[in-house]
């Protein structure tokens, strides 16, 4: 899906009303400098490709975070101020019923999601120059 | 104006079903989760179940294996199929816009559901 | 399914300030919703993402959350404001939107 007609402002929003306190829920228990940021993104739309990415795509060690709170926050937001998004989701949505994990809290996805919160981070401030 | 249009309610005996609907105007309707919330003469609110655009589905533990809840994205709608249905089922049925599936920012009218002999 | 608890009912005279609180375990780790309910209505969001307004919802609506309680504060109480008031979150677990058992306010 390419992300660049997306409301940015409006996901932001989302991101700052309704999906950073889970993500900090998550990873309660967890020191901010236990993991370094390894994923990044230079511009907004290519922010959220990382962030689907991260946040639905099975990876070794974390197969489950796409069940979290806050993916099903972010799936919502990106339905709604993504053009077209709902419908590129239906078929991903049907093979992924096949291989439904049940959620299951590794070391793997809590690096996993310290990623995301960079990438939400890096989405929040476009403005910045790339590290 | 966005606006939600729920019917289908009325009187069945226990044991019976019902099919709710939903009409939904205004808004990008295949873009949203929806769901049906209740309300019991008197008492408070009750979420019911919940449906991504997708067909994801989630179902409060009290209509399990008895409420199907599902849309025609097509046609706009949004539907509550309860069978087997309890004298502790009647209440006042709300249509919803989940807004970023925690929070309701749109309801319906609302349509009462009588179950009774 | 995490419980909400919420006090029956909370009285205020006018232009008082009322507070109606939101217990549960945890609940600072969530975000918090309030609806308010008047007779024969459907009810309306007045705070969401824990202090956040709707537009139209008037600027005596406040509110906040942290450790396991939220609160919902009406400044300058009118008339107008009587009515139910749910708070909302949801379980982290079963994913399933919970409310509270709701206030009725009574401007006195």
């Known amino acids: 899906y390419d992300f660049t007609n997306c409301d940015f402002e409006k996901i932001k929003a989302a991101y700052l009303s309704t999906i950073s306190k889970d993500l900090i829920t998550y990873m309660s228990g967890t020191k901010s400098t236990e993991f370094n940021n390894t994923v990044s993104c230079s511009n907004r739309p290519h922010c959220l490709t990382e962030i689907q990415s991260l946040t639905f795509n099975p990876t070794a060690g974390c197969a489950s975070l796409a069940k979290e709170m806050f993916a099903m926050k972010t799936k919502a937001a990106l339905a709604i101020w993504c053009p077209g998004y709902s419908e590129t989701q239906i078929n991903a949505t049907q093979a992924m019923k096949k291989r439904r994990k049940r959620k299951v809290t590794t070391n793997k996805c809590l690096e996993q999601v310290s990623q995301l919160q960079g990438l939400w981070r890096r989405f929040n401030r476009p403005l910045l120059k790339q590290q | 104006q966005v606006q939600l249009v729920e019917s289908g309610g009325g009187l069945v005996q226990p044991g019976g079903s019902l099919r709710l609907s939903c009409a939904a105007s205004?808004?990008?309707?295949?873009?949203?989760?929806m769901s049906w919330v209740r309300q019991a003469p008197g008492k408070g609110l009750e979420w019911v179940s919940g449906i991504f655009f997708d067909g994801t589905t989630y179902y409060a533990d009290s209509v399990k294996g008895r409420f199907t809840i599902s849309r025609d994205n097509s046609k706009n709608t949004l539907y509550l199929q309860m069978n087997s249905l309890r004298a502790e089922d009647t209440a006042v049925y709300y249509c919803a816009r989940q807004q970023y599936f925690d929070h309701i920012d749109i309801w319906g009218q609302g349509t009462l559901v009588t179950v009774s002999s | 399914d995490i419980e909400l608890t919420q006090p029956p009912s909370v009285s205020v005279a006018p232009g008082q300030t009322a507070r109606i609180s939101c217990g549960g375990d945890?609940?600072?780790?969530?975000?918090v919703y309030w609806y308010q309910q008047k007779p024969g209505q459907a009810p309306v969001l007045v705070i969401y993402g824990d202090s956040k307004r709707p537009s139209g919802i008037p600027e005596r609506f406040s509110g906040s959350n942290s450790g396991n309680t939220a609160t919902l504060t009406i400044s300058g109480t009118q008339a107008e404001d009587e009515a139910d008031y749910y708070c909302?979150?949801?379980?982290?677990?079963?994913?399933?939107?919970?409310f509270g058992g709701g206030t009725k306010l009574t401007v006195l």
């Open positions: 205004g808004f990008t309707f295949s873009s949203y989760y």
């Open positions: 909302q979150s949801y379980d982290l677990k079963s994913l399933n939107v919970v």
């Open positions: 945890s609940l600072g780790g969530k975000y």
